[in-house]
Interface confidence: low
């Protein structure tokens, strides 16, 4: 399932986009998974949709399940799933660890903390930021546009970061709050061109005809927090996402950091059902960042069904 | 795209680009250049924060910008040397649909404009 998990506060504003891509000419229409019934596009709505957004405004815990998002198109039709759930707002100030965004890292060099998911929303500046549920003051403290940056970083510094803003649709304002830990790193790190650690290059992979298969990607790209770094997967030269072949989807892994440091993305591409023709597409692993890109091509073979002996 | 067209070297163009407000939205936008018969490259990119990114070769020479309220991509070109001539295309994307990513790479991208013609004569 290409499906994506999505979680808010009850009463505050939750905008989830639908986990398929697609032209902004393709409809989207949307239904609540459990019951098949459909979404209502008027903004009078409480939960509506708009296109590739499903808004909750604002969301209550009933709200929580899971939502089908199609893209239509002339000639195919994308499904997307997505989790949403809805919490009771905390009485006290702990932040429980299934409402907590991506860590992110930080050094005295670069210390940006992202609020996450404000994209989705319609927000003016300023942010407000609070660490450890207190308001965030003092001059070492700086809310840029949807970051903020700490000046002088200490490891002090670390802690659970939330940012509060409010969003506007229609006139109506909604406040939104999410949180993220920041850590703080000593090491100076450094970027490098993208190292491909899986597949080899020009790998022969073994797959069983109707059986499914996944093929990773893994690429290292430097010491320390990479803040421009990507894996993915084409098809023929062509986006997963544009390939449209729903039986093939790209699936992101883990960020890894190993003891030496270095800073690793991993792209997992998953085929369902292998059939015949897959043995005839080239699989090409991407590796990217600011330095170039690095491509290892895969091609999958048939696997001979082993033979029992008795 | 518009605003392209034929300039002497060492001259300045601002080529712009009016998108949709789907395509706007997209996290990332940027420009592109392809060259006869080359491969198209990026050549700068901006978040939706504003954040900007540029290709090495360029030298500070480019600044890629955005008018949030005309729904408007700008790249403007100083100091051009003949060997920027090339067609400019503009194009939005979500990054990699990873969290924060905006650089000048075709991948990077969903949706591309027509494209506009840049020629720099020595």
């Known amino acids: 399932k290409f499906s994506k998990q999505s979680w808010g506060l009850e009463n505050e504003a939750l905008i989830v986009r639908c986990p398929r891509q697609g032209k902004p000419s393709y409809t989207v229409d949307w239904y609540y998974s459990q019951t098949n019934k459909s979404i209502p596009t008027q903004e009078r709505n409480r939960v509506f949709a708009s296109g590739q957004l499903l808004k909750f405004l604002p969301a209550a815990v009933a709200d929580s399940g899971i939502y089908t998002c199609i893209v239509r198109s002339p000639t195919f039709n994308r499904t997307g799933y997505a989790n949403v759930t809805i919490y009771k707002k905390q009485s006290d100030c702990n932040v429980p660890d299934y409402l907590m965004y991506s860590t992110v890292s930080g050094s005295e060099k670069n210390s940006k903390i992202y609020c996450p998911t404000i994209d989705l929303y319609n927000w003016t500046a300023p942010l407000e930021w609070f660490k450890n549920c207190q308001a965030l003051q003092g001059s070492r403290y700086r809310a840029h546009k949807s970051f903020l940056v700490i000046d002088n970083v200490m490891t002090e510094d670390a802690g659970d970061y939330t940012c509060k803003f409010i969003h506007n649709e229609n006139g109506a304002n909604y406040s939104v709050t999410a949180t993220r830990s920041f850590t703080v790193k000593d090491e100076q790190g450094f970027s490098l061109f993208p190292v491909i650690g899986a597949p080899a290059q020009n790998e022969i992979k073994e797959v069983e005809i109707g059986k499914n298969a996944n093929l990773t990607c893994s690429a290292c790209f430097g010491k320390g927090t990479q803040f421009l770094a990507a894996v993915l997967w084409q098809l023929n030269g062509t986006k997963i996402t544009d390939f449209g072949e729903p039986r093939i989807q790209q699936e992101e892994g883990q960020n890894q950091s190993f003891s030496n440091g270095l800073a690793c993305l991993d792209m997992v591409l998953r085929i369902a059902d292998v059939k015949e023709e897959d043995l005839l597409l080239q699989y090409d692993c991407l590796a990217l960042n600011l330095h170039g890109l690095r491509r290892h091509t895969v091609r999958l073979s048939r696997k001979n069904p082993s033979k029992e002996c008795f | 795209e518009s605003g392209g067209g034929s300039v002497q070297a060492g001259g300045s163009l601002r080529v712009s680009c009016a998108a949709s407000?789907?395509?706007?939205?997209?996290?990332?936008m940027g420009w592109f250049r392809q060259a006869p018969g080359k491969e198209r490259e990026g050549v700068a990119s901006i978040d939706s924060r504003g954040s900007t990114t540029y290709a090495d070769s360029l030298k500070g020479r480019f600044t890629i910008s955005k008018d949030n309220a005309k729904n408007t991509l700008y790249l403007q070109m100083n100091n051009l040397k003949p060997e920027d001539t090339a067609k400019y295309y503009c194009a939005a994307g979500d990054g990699y649909g990873l969290e924060h990513i905006c650089i000048p790479h075709y991948y990077a991208m969903n949706y591309w404009g027509e494209g506009t013609q840049v020629t720099v004569s020595s």
């Open positions: 407000g789907y395509t706007y939205s997209s996290y990332c």
